[in-house]
């Protein structure tokens, strides 16, 4: 899978956590963006 980020980044973020993708695990199915 592929995600492109730019001026309108749609990273989902909670109030306190970073919006970056968490470290991969074997259950990971796609890169977050």
């Amino acid at each position: 899978s592929e995600t492109t980020t730019g001026t309108s980044s749609n990273s989902s973020q909670s109030t306190s956590n970073s919006g970056l993708a968490p470290n991969p695990t074997n259950a990971t199915t796609k890169a977050a963006g």
């Epitope: 980044s9 970056l20 990971t28 796609k30």
Partner: antibody, heavy 118, light 107 residues
Framework: EVQLQQSGPELVKPGASVKISCKAS????????MNWVKQSPEKSLEWIGE????????TYNQKFRAKATLTVDRSSSTAYMQLKSLTSEDSAVYYC???????????WGQGTTLIVSS | DVQITQSPSYLAAFPGETITINCRAS??????LAWYQEKPGKTNNLLIY???TLQSGIPSRFSGSGTGTDFTLTISSLEPEDFAMYYC?????????FGAGTKLELK
């Protein structure tokens, strides 16, 4: 000891493509995203994108979407970045860097210098 | 994209002095700012992440502060090996973005 060993300098002609490698050791290669960063005198540091070593899933900076392609070879714990349709503006130092969710870009390769010139 | 404004771009100091470098984000990045040191012939070194957390192995004379949009890197009692380039970088959202850098030179 975590190490990211990048391939050597490249001198290529405008319009050509180049593929830079980054061999990881000293940590679980599949446990962390591999990121790529461009450093040029004009623009300082620019994030190109990242790849999930398990799935091959990628996230790109929109600016580099048409320029860079990120891949991995899990069997050799190596990440690759291909740059295409090269111009003089692509002349820069390119870094691979391991991203940990908590600490961000915690280990960097030594950099690969790319010169695009006819 | 989150724009990061880093200042000053150049700083000269004596060993033993305390210096500060500032980064301002164009919008809130919560606590998610990292600081890096760049020296010729060495790989880039992560100093601080999440605004104020010292990376393992980094001397305690390095400290970071700030949340939201304004952040500061402080180096207390400068050592000769601290004269280098410093960059900040937000790790709150994609695309990751960096400050333009601060060159710390020996006065």
């Amino acid at each position: 000891e975590v190490q990211l060993q990048q391939s050597g300098p490249e001198l290529v002609k405008p319009g050509a493509s180049v593929k830079i490698s980054c061999k990881a050791s000293g940590y679980s290669f599949t446990g962390y995203y591999m990121n790529w960063v461009k450093q040029s005198p004009e623009k300082s540091l620019e994030w190109i994108g990242e790849i999930n070593p398990i799935t091959g899933g990628t996230t790109y900076n929109q600016k580099f979407r048409a320029k860079a392609t990120l891949t991995v070879d899990r069997s050799s714990s190596t990440a690759y970045m291909q740059l295409k349709s090269l111009t003089s503006e692509d002349s820069a130092v390119y870094y691979c860097t391991k991203r940990d969710y908590d600490t961000s870009l915690d280990y960097w390769g030594q950099g690969t210098t790319l010169i695009v010139s006819s | 994209d989150v724009q990061i404004t880093q200042s000053p771009s150049y700083l000269a100091a004596f060993p033993g002095e305390t210096i500060t470098i500032n980064c301002r984000a164009s919008k809130s990045i919560k606590k998610y700012l990292a600081w890096y040191q760049e020296k010729p012939g060495k790989t880039n070194n992560l100093l601080i992440y999440s605004g104020s957390t010292l990376q393992s192995g980094i001397p305690s004379r390095f400290s970071g502060s700030g949340t939201g949009t304004d952040f500061t890197l402080t180096i207390s009692s400068l050592e000769p090996e601290d004269f280098a380039m410093y960059y900040c970088q937000q790790h709150n959202e994609y695309p990751l973005t960096f400050g333009a850098g601060t060159k710390l030179e020996l006065k």
